[in-house]
């Protein structure tokens, strides 16, 4: 039994006390307008289904929907006592997409609709959505819609990103299997693609797929290997999306950056970070780019957006993802060094200029210091108890380096018996030396080891 | 990381048939070709053929077609070669080895070998 | 098809002393790969593309030469590296040398 403080109120006219359910007249099966109470809270009742009449002798209305007079007053006793009929009304005015991919005017549409399915024994319809089925509920003053600027500046840059695939034939069936993979990004409408250099080489096929899936074969039309930046084209009919480059001079430290790509085709990979530090000197960070400063940042950089962009929050391209250290510690080469390449690579094409030759052993590297250091030791237990040298972040394949031994994590301590306290010491001897005889710390144990530096072309 | 396992040591009168094999491991074997390669005292390694696993095409050393008859099953990453109406000259150690390549775009060579599965052919 | 002559066949060197070996080859190729065998164990790769250390190999260990004319060299001849070895190319269909087998002294 119910008490009458359970009931809602007010209270029609004649109701009893106390509700006892064994009264309540019986019910049928299935109600068009869903369950409602009767007047008195007391016994379930087939409510009116939207559009009936409503009030005065009509009953209540069913789940969902209230009794609104023609003006549009809801009902209540005061419009029962003036004797005027009311319309059902759904509460809820919004569509919805319904687990049938129906579009409903509103809940109750789709709940009626429900009620129909059950009754014909189908599944109950649910909502998936609010807003119609196939488009996204929009709501300018949800928090979502206001405070999701990552997202603005994703779906702004995202149609310029593309997914870079490389190809090599096998030597007798001559089928063509993907070797490696990136991320580049458009930067000219007519389709120029900047990407890192080790993402592409001159003697596989390169395959650029676009965001809306079309594929294109690339020619390489420069790379800069010291800088790790090459330029590929593709042939488009039409103009394509393309990203600006922005000031990474500007950049100060502690500003959001996006950092994008697009690893498997027709999908985009996002990270997103701030920016650490603006001006992480080059000969630190790797010989290949002795000259050229990075951005670090903790957005997450990995095989999945390597070569594609590091953005600001206006969608500027201030740097090319290009490798991660550790976890919380990535690099992007700066956008004006990007901006430097292109400039001269126009150039080189249109004089053929010739390029000197360079030292080079493959290694990235940084200066240790105390603080860095002890940030590396609270990541990694084992990490050698030295503040200072040359701490290599990544041996690259197939060079002097990887011949001589030299491994991720070592710090060069010193190289033909002159002690190296930072990474420029190191490219120093580099320029000057043929031979490096370096001792380098490994967890706890020194170990002696040579690398014979090649040249390449910068 | 990547290895070839091949199948035991085999002891076989001359005229019959043995089938050897190469179990793949730490990479995909659909992305490079199996090739087998056999080492005599006398005459010392000898390119024999080649398999697309992805495909089953195969290409052979003129000498050894009609000798040896290379198959892969994808689905167990296994390469297999069939010898027929052997001879002592067939007594060898026979290897699987993956064909490797240049990232900077040389030729091909022979990256990763099995351990070499020895054949005798006596009465 | 290509035929590739190794010399000398037998050699043999001190510890610490340089080392070299060549590989003549029939007619001209882009590249020559070579390998290390030592008894009871499989072929390695030492050298790829003419002059590319595979991973893994010591720097003492270098590879030159064009067309038809190649060369392993060993800086310092260490023991470990007492082995036979091979040259190998791939023009139509890969061929190798007849090793040749260097001793420690």
């Known amino acids: 039994q119910l008490s009458r403080a359970g009931r809602s109120a007010p209270l029609a006219a004649g109701c009893p006390d106390r509700c006892e359910p064994a009264r309540c007249p019986p019910q049928p099966e299935h109600c068009e307008g869903g369950r409602a109470r009767d007047a008195c809270g007391c016994c379930e009742v087939c409510g009116a289904p939207e559009g009936a009449a409503c009030g005065l002798q009509e009953g209540p209305c069913g789940e969902g929907l209230q009794c609104v007079v023609p003006f549009g007053v809801p009902a209540s006793a005061t419009v029962r006592r003036r004797a005027q009929a009311g319309l059902c009304v759904c509460a809820s005015s919004e569509p919805v997409c319904g687990s049938d991919a129906n579009t409903y005017a509103n809940l109750c549409q789709l709940r009626a609709a429900s009620r129909r399915s059950e009754r014909l024994h189908r599944p109950p319809v649910i909502v998936l959505q609010r807003g119609a089925c196939g488009q996204g509920q929009e709501d300018p003053n949800s928090l979502r819609h206001k405070y999701n600027f990552i997202a603005d500046v994703v779906e702004k840059i995202a149609p310029a990103v593309v997914h870079i695939e490389l190809f090599r034939k096998l030597p007798f069936s001559k089928r063509e299997v993907p070797v490696a993979s990136g991320s580049g990004f458009i930067v000219s409408e007519d389709g120029l693609i900047v990407t890192n250099a080790h993402v592409v080489t001159n003697k596989h096929r390169v395959k650029v797929e676009l965001k809306n899936g079309a594929t294109y074969e690339a020619k390489i039309k420069d790379v800069d290997e010291k800088a790790d930046i090459a330029l590929i084209k593709i042939d488009h009919q039409g103009k394509l999306p393309v990203l600006l480059l922005g000031r990474s001079s500007e950049l100060r430290p502690g500003e959001f950056v996006v950092a994008i790509g697009s690893p498997f085709s027709l999908q985009n990979t996002v990270t997103t970070g701030i920016v650490s530090t603006t001006q992480r000197g080059g000969k630190e960070l790797g010989l290949r780019n002795s000259d050229m400063d990075y951005i670090q940042t903790d957005a997450i950089i990995n095989y999945g957006n390597s070569g594609g962009p590091l953005v600001n929050l206006d969608g500027e391209v201030i740097g090319i993802n290009t490798l991660k250290v550790t976890a919380g510690i990535s690099f992007a080469i700066p956008s004006d060094k990007i901006k430097k390449f292109l400039t001269e690579s126009h150039d080189r094409q249109a004089k053929g200029k010739a390029i000197t030759k360079k030292k080079y052993i493959g290694i990235r590297m940084m200066s240790l210091t105390s603080s860095k250091a002890k940030e590396l030791k609270d990541r990694h237990r084992d990490f050698p108890d030295v503040i200072s040298g040359a701490y290599i972040i990544e041996v690259i394949p197939d060079t002097p380096a990887e011949a001589g031994g030299l491994k991720e994590n070592d710090v060069i301590i010193s190289i033909n018996g002159q002690s190296v306290v930072s990474a420029n010491d190191v490219s120093d001897v580099i320029k000057r030396e043929s031979t490096l005889n370096m001792v380098v710390r490994r967890g706890n144990e020194d170990i002696m080891i040579t690398v014979i530096p090649e040249e390449i072309d910068p | 990381q990547v290895q070839l396992q091949q199948s035991g040591a085999e002891l076989v009168r001359p005229g019959a048939s043995v089938k050897l094999s190469c179990k793949a491991s730490?990479?995909?074997?659909?992305?490079?070709?199996m090739h087998w390669v056999k080492q005599t005292p006398v005459h010392g390694l000898e390119w024999i053929g080649a398999?697309?696993?992805?495909?089953?095409?195969?290409a052979y050393n003129q000498k050894f077609k009609g000798k040896a008859t290379l198959t892969a099953d994808k689905s167990s990453s296994t390469a297999y070669m069939e010898l027929r109406s052997l001879t002592s000259e067939d007594s060898a150690v026979y290897y699987c080895?993956?064909?490797?390549?240049?990232?900077?775009?040389?030729?091909?060579?022979?990256?990763?070998w099995g351990q070499g599965t020895t054949l005798t052919v006596s009465s | 098809q290509i035929v590739l002559t190794q010399s000398p066949a037998i050699m043999s060197a001190s510890p610490g002393e340089k080392v070299t070996m060549t590989c003549s080859v029939s007619?001209?190729?882009?590249?020559m790969y070579w390998y290390q065998q030592k008894p009871g164990s499989s072929p390695r790769l030492l050298i790829y593309?003419?002059?590319n250390l595979a991973s893994g190999v010591p720097v003492r260990f270098s590879g030159s030469g064009s067309g038809t004319s190649y060369s392993l060299t060993i800086s310092r001849m260490e023991a470990e590296d007492a082995a036979t070895y091979y040259c190998?190319?791939?023009?139509?269909?890969?061929?190798f040398g007849g090793g040749t087998k260097l001793e420690i002294k």
């Open positions: 080895t993956r064909e490797g390549y240049s990232y900077d775009g040389g030729g091909y060579y022979f990256d990763y």
């Open positions: 730490g990479y995909t074997f659909t992305d490079y070709e």
């Open positions: 398999i697309d696993p992805e495909t089953g095409g195969t």
């Open positions: 007619s001209s190729v882009s590249y």
């Open positions: 593309d003419t002059s």
């Open positions: 190998q190319q791939w023009s139509s269909y890969p061929t």
